[in-house]
Interface confidence: medium
């Protein structure tokens, strides 16, 4: 079944290559297990950036080598993506799945355009 997912249209990464945004879903039921996936769309290619399954009320657990971290509060997921460079600029789509209990729900946001600008190198000081 379909579910609405909201996320900001545009986010500018910090000079350290960190971008944060909120992914909010309109939960039609009382889900206890939720899966959140961040997808990056650039040109016609869609790639999975990171994914985490969490139990409501608990922390999101991404893989150790993931560039994502996050926290959840009710129907909101606060996502942070680190280590971004200019080449990572693109549309980052939040996909939310209510895994348990049934029925299964899927929601896909319209995407957050993340702009990443590589910092200028510091000039050498004499």
């Amino acid at each position: 079944k379909a579910m609405h997912v909201a996320q900001p249209a545009v986010v500018l990464a910090s000079s350290r290559g960190i971008a944060s945004f909120v992914c909010e879903y309109a939960s039609p039921g009382k889900a206890t297990e939720v899966r959140v996936t961040v997808l990056r769309q650039a040109d016609s290619q869609v790639t999975e950036v990171c994914a985490a399954t969490y139990m409501m009320g608990n922390e999101l657990t991404f893989l150790d080598d993931s560039i994502c971290t996050g926290t959840s509060s009710g129907n909101q997921v606060n996502l942070t993506i680190q280590g971004l460079r200019a080449m990572d600029t693109g549309l980052y789509i939040c996909k939310v799945e209510l895994m348990y209990p049934p029925p299964y729900y899927l929601g896909i946001g319209n995407g957050t355009q993340i702009y990443v600008i590589d910092p200028e190198p510091c000039p050498d000081s004499d």
Epitope: K1, A2, R35, T37, L39, Q41, S44, Q45, V46, T47, E48, I93, K95, E97, M99, P103, Y104, L106, I108
Partner: nanobody, 135 residues
């Protein structure tokens, strides 16, 4: 640039057959789901069939089950819709559409047909080909 080009439409008598083709360029079918949709004058666009090119899963609307068959040729980057036993109510403009598999349910088959046959699930669309079933 992603492009989908439909062909194979035309005028056919009731009970006849047609094979529609959807040629994709700008991406490979391997990771995409391709759906066929149709829109009759004054009606909403409705899902007809879909094939998930990553695992070959197929989905059909109840109105065409047993009459239409969807298939793919990854080497030609083309998806086909074989339409048999055509009826006047099959008259419509037929469109093919594509969406990356990652943007569909993680659990394949779990409510799958609902998403695969929803027009709003798809990102890329062709221009359409007219199918007219009339005697």
């Amino acid at each position: 640039e992603v492009q989908l080009v439909e062909s194979g439409g035309g005028l056919v008598q009731p009970g006849g057959s047609l094979r529609l083709s959807c040629a994709a360029s700008g991406f490979t079918l391997d990771y995409y789901a391709i759906g066929w949709f149709r829109q009759a004058p004054g009606k909403e666009r409705e899902g007809v069939s879909c094939i998930d090119s990553s695992d070959g899963s197929t989905y059909y609307a109840d109105s065409v089950k047993g009459r239409f068959t969807i298939s793919r040729d990854n080497a030609k980057n083309t998806v086909y819709l074989q339409m048999n036993s055509l009826k006047p109510e099959d008259t419509a403009v037929y469109y093919c559409a594509a969406v990356h598999g990652l943007k569909l349910p993680t659990l394949r088959g779990l409510g799958g047909s609902y998403y695969y046959l929803q027009a709003r699930s798809y990102d890329y669309w062709g221009q359409g080909t007219q199918v007219t079933v009339s005697s």
